[in-house]
């Protein structure tokens, strides 16, 4: 069958029919439905929502919808023994205690099962000691403290402000510095945008608001007790002492009212520079300990949370492909939330729901996609991407042979300024072409394309007239598909103006105030930005599942590989003497990139010319495109990070949220001047250049003519 015969209508008409069926009003209705009660992973409420989504997806017309369950390690506060932090006097009396819960938002005062703020997977403990303020607790912040200021965090409780990097990296850094506890807080400098009121009168964080979140360092492992394998009924589980990524010191989050009470008494060293000062009326002294009058007072943490193996549920929906049912395009986003999930994740889940409904409507009219589309509602994302990772571990053999693409669908909005896209270079042209066909929802861009408003508001730093597209990092459910399995992946959402809003994420992230009303009143009253995100995500899935030739352009990978090679070479060239001494050469990498560029160019020419009516040749060319991303996977993984196997991209070792290019070489070069054995360190740089060069060359050869 030709594609058109199989799919009943002309491809262009199908795409238009699909997009026209997406309705803002439906997304609004779904968001409301998904946000009335908390849906914490492992709870009965979230199981019920899974069954509701399963039922509705069936009604919408999917061929099958199944629940996939796993028993994974989760973490909860002790209901009868709350977590808090105290200031204690010399007699051990608690003279100040941090809050036990957030003041509930209006209309939600009688909602039960709101989990109080906590740092998921914190060990239990009641450490007490002097406080040290460590800014954002980034690698560079600890360098400043330890190397420049000669401040020792060993045996201290550190207090760090949220923002800039993933909280798990902060905790890891504090542990390595010898701290015995970590307090995380939201500073108004990062979570209170000037000129905007606090919730419920605006979208800013009130003083009693607190960001929840996990503090794991899983490095892609999934369930901490079953790394590499699904947490199924017959799983062998590690003991807790051997679990992957658990923190070893107590950690707890607080809001800025409580932070004020802890920071206002700080003594010791003054902040090293203005970048260490937030917006509270406190000196931001680094410590250690409190100032003169209060020097005998200490800080004490009381953490009683427990880790428990708990059942979680993914919802997996299938829309079978008419021509290539063994090729999978996946749209997935999580369902579990910390509390109401007004933005994270339900603004994304509502969009997925409407995309499923639109695809179902087309299917009921006799249409099918060329390739199979899988829809996923993941569980336990907030606890370390557990649902998606366990499912991918269980289905890894199918996915590595059949996975065409994965499109992520967490929060649809983190602002309402412009589009934000992170994806594999293979999808650049798909995203460009699609956004040129979509209408911009932005004020002042009526009648203009989304591409135009996006490019104007978020221009590419390298190519004029093009929009910025970022590297994939992690911190979301695409991780296992991209970083471990090498399946081409992408994500899209509406974002804030990064130039004028310097706060990290959005102010109410992971707080009780992330409600339906937050979205409906302040972010997107008409749900036009949600609709646009639905069109982008849905449009990408449609094209990936339905275009005769996969909409991947391998030449764009060639361009970025050259850029990344130049960048890593320039980092290495900061050490010209050592490069000479240890005979470090990037020639092999640049040669491989050159070969890749030439072969990709020739492949693209063949792609234009081949006989698309020949199903064998079509399948062969498509397979070369599908398997290109896979070719960047090193089966041995990155050093000490076996589940990060992509040689071109990995989550930064210093910030899980950020993507790093040529991560093996980057990490080998990082802080190399401080290594005790320079010969060994530069030897590892050389080995990583070798691995990268080999991988790029091997990937290039997958695009060569097959015989």
């Amino acid at each position: 069958k030709s594609s058109n015969e199989a799919t009943n209508i002309t491809p262009k008409h199908n795409m238009k029919a699909f997009l026209d069926e997406l309705k803002a009003e439906n997304i609004k209705k779904f968001l409301y439905n998904f946000t009335q009660i908390p849906h914490l992973a492992g709870t009965e409420q979230n199981f019920q929502l899974a069954k509701q989504i399963q039922s509705q997806w069936k009604e919408f017309g999917l061929d099958s919808v199944e629940l996939a369950h796993y028993d994974v390690l989760l973490s909860y506060p002790n209901k009868t023994h709350p977590n808090y932090i105290s200031i204690i006097n010399e007699d051990g009396n608690e003279i100040f205690n941090t809050s036990l819960f957030e003041p509930p938002p209006p209309g939600y005062e009688n909602v039960s099962d709101i989990v109080p703020p906590f740092s998921a997977f914190s060990p239990q403990g009641m450490p007490e000691g002097d406080l040290v303020y460590v800014n954002y607790a980034r690698t560079e912040d600890f360098f400043k403290l330890e190397r420049d200021m000669k401040i020792n965090c060993s045996g201290k409780i550190v207090i760090a402000r949220y923002g800039k990097v993933f909280r798990g990296n902060k905790v890891k850094n504090a542990q390595l510095a010898g701290a015995k506890g970590v307090i995380l807080y939201s500073d108004p400098a990062d979570y209170f945008a000037p000129g905007v009121k606090s919730y419920p009168d605006g979208w800013n964080l009130p003083g009693g608001g607190v960001q929840r979140g996990n503090i794991l360092n899983l490095n892609g492992a999934g369930d901490p007790l079953t790394p590499g394998y699904p947490a199924n009924e017959y799983a062998y589980r590690r003991g807790i002492a051997e679990a992957v990524g658990l923190p070893s010191i107590p950690v707890h989050p607080i809001g800025y009212y409580d932070a004020q009470k802890l920071l206002e008494k700080m003594g010791g060293s003054a902040p090293p520079d203005s970048s260490w000062r937030g917006s509270l009326k406190v000196p931001y002294n680094v410590g250690p300990g409190f100032t003169g009058n209060f020097s005998t007072q200490k800080v004490k943490m009381h953490i009683h949370s427990t880790n428990e193996v708990t059942r979680i549920y993914n919802v997996i929906g299938t829309l079978r492909g008419a021509v290539e049912p063994d090729r999978y395009v996946i749209l997935g986003g999580h369902r579990d939330s910390w509390v109401f999930g007004g933005i994270d994740p339900q603004s994304g889940a509502a969009v997925v729901h409407e995309i499923v409904r639109s695809f179902g409507t087309l299917k009921k009219e006799g249409w099918r996609p060329r390739r199979t589309i899988l829809f996923a509602s993941w569980d336990a994302e907030e606890f370390g991407l557990l649902g998606s990772t366990e499912w991918a571990e269980e289905n890894s053999r199918l996915l590595q042979e059949r996975g065409v693409a994965y499109i992520n669908a967490d929060s649809s909005i983190e602002g309402n300024y412009t589009l934000r896209v992170d994806c594999t270079p293979l999808m650049y042209s798909l995203v460009h072409n699609l956004t040129k066909e979509l209408k911009s929802p932005d004020e002042g861009f009526e009648g203009k394309s989304l591409y135009e408003s996006w490019t104007k508001k978020s221009p590419s730093p390298e190519f004029s007239g093009m929009p910025r597209i970022s590297k994939l990092g992690s911190g979301n459910d695409f991780e296992v598909f991209f970083q471990r399995l090498g399946i081409a992946s992408g994500r899209a959402r509406y974002t804030k103006n990064w130039e004028t809003n310097k706060f990290s994420g959005y102010p109410l992230y992971h707080s009780v105030y992330e409600t339906y009303e937050l979205v409906e009143k302040f972010y997107d009253p008409m749900f036009k930005y949600h609709l646009t995100v639905a069109q982008v995500r849905g449009g990408m899935v449609f094209e990936l599942a339905n275009s005769i030739v996969l909409p991947f352009d391998c030449r764009d990978y060639a361009v970025v590989l050259r850029k990344y090679a130049d960048k890593i070479y320039s980092i290495s060239m900061k050490h010209p003497q050592e490069m000479k001494t240890y005979s470090v050469s990037f020639d092999s990498l640049f040669s491989a990139v050159k070969n890749f560029t030439e072969i990709a160019s020739k492949f693209s020419e063949r792609l234009q010319d081949f006989d698309k009516s020949n199903p064998i040749v079509l399948r062969m060319m498509n397979d070369q495109l599908m398997f290109l991303e896979r070719a960047f996977i090193d089966p041995l993984g990155l050093p000490d990070r076996p589940f990060y196997r992509h040689v071109i991209y990995a989550p930064s070792s210093h910030n899980k949220y950020a993507g790093e290019s040529f991560p093996g070489i980057y990490d080998a070069l990082f802080d190399i001047e401080s290594k005790v054995d320079p010969s060994k360190a530069w030897g590892e740089v050389k080995r990583q250049i070798y691995v990268a060069a080999f991988t790029v060359q091997a990937a290039a050869e997958t695009l060569s003519e097959v015989a």
């Epitope: 808090y84 100040f96 205690n97 941090t98 809050s99 036990l100 819960f101 957030e102 003041p103 509930p104 209006p106 005062e109 009130p206 003083g207 009693g208 608001g209 809001g255 009212y257 409580d258 004020q260 009470k261």
Partner: nanobody, 123 residues
Framework: QVQLVESGGGVVQPGRSLRLSCAAS????????MNWVRQAPGKGLEWVAF????????YYADSVKGRFTISRDNSKNTLYLQMNSLRAEDTAVYYC????????????????WGQGTMVTVSS
Amino acid sequence: QVQLVESGGGVVQPGRSLRLSCAASGFPLISYGMNWVRQAPGKGLEWVAFITYDGSNRYYADSVKGRFTISRDNSKNTLYLQMNSLRAEDTAVYYCAKDRIVGARVPDAYDIWGQGTMVTVSS
């Protein structure tokens, strides 16, 4: 409408105990710090005690420390003041007052007051 209603006052002998209640209506008590304030006959207002919205912190005037206990039951939208070892100088009209800032960790300005309940300590 938004209001606070105190109850539990009366005449009591020195050294005895009394428990005052303050029922809130028209607003969610759970979000606000609450205070007890008193006014002795012919005197100005004196702050007595404060409890944070979640009950995690309680602060007392030196004059009542160790004798009075402020508490709350958010599910009943009610504030309490347990007064033990009462003295003649505790004679006053006792008012409950709502803190104006949601989630405040220390006493701030008050924006809603009750009508007060009279406590007389006399032998």
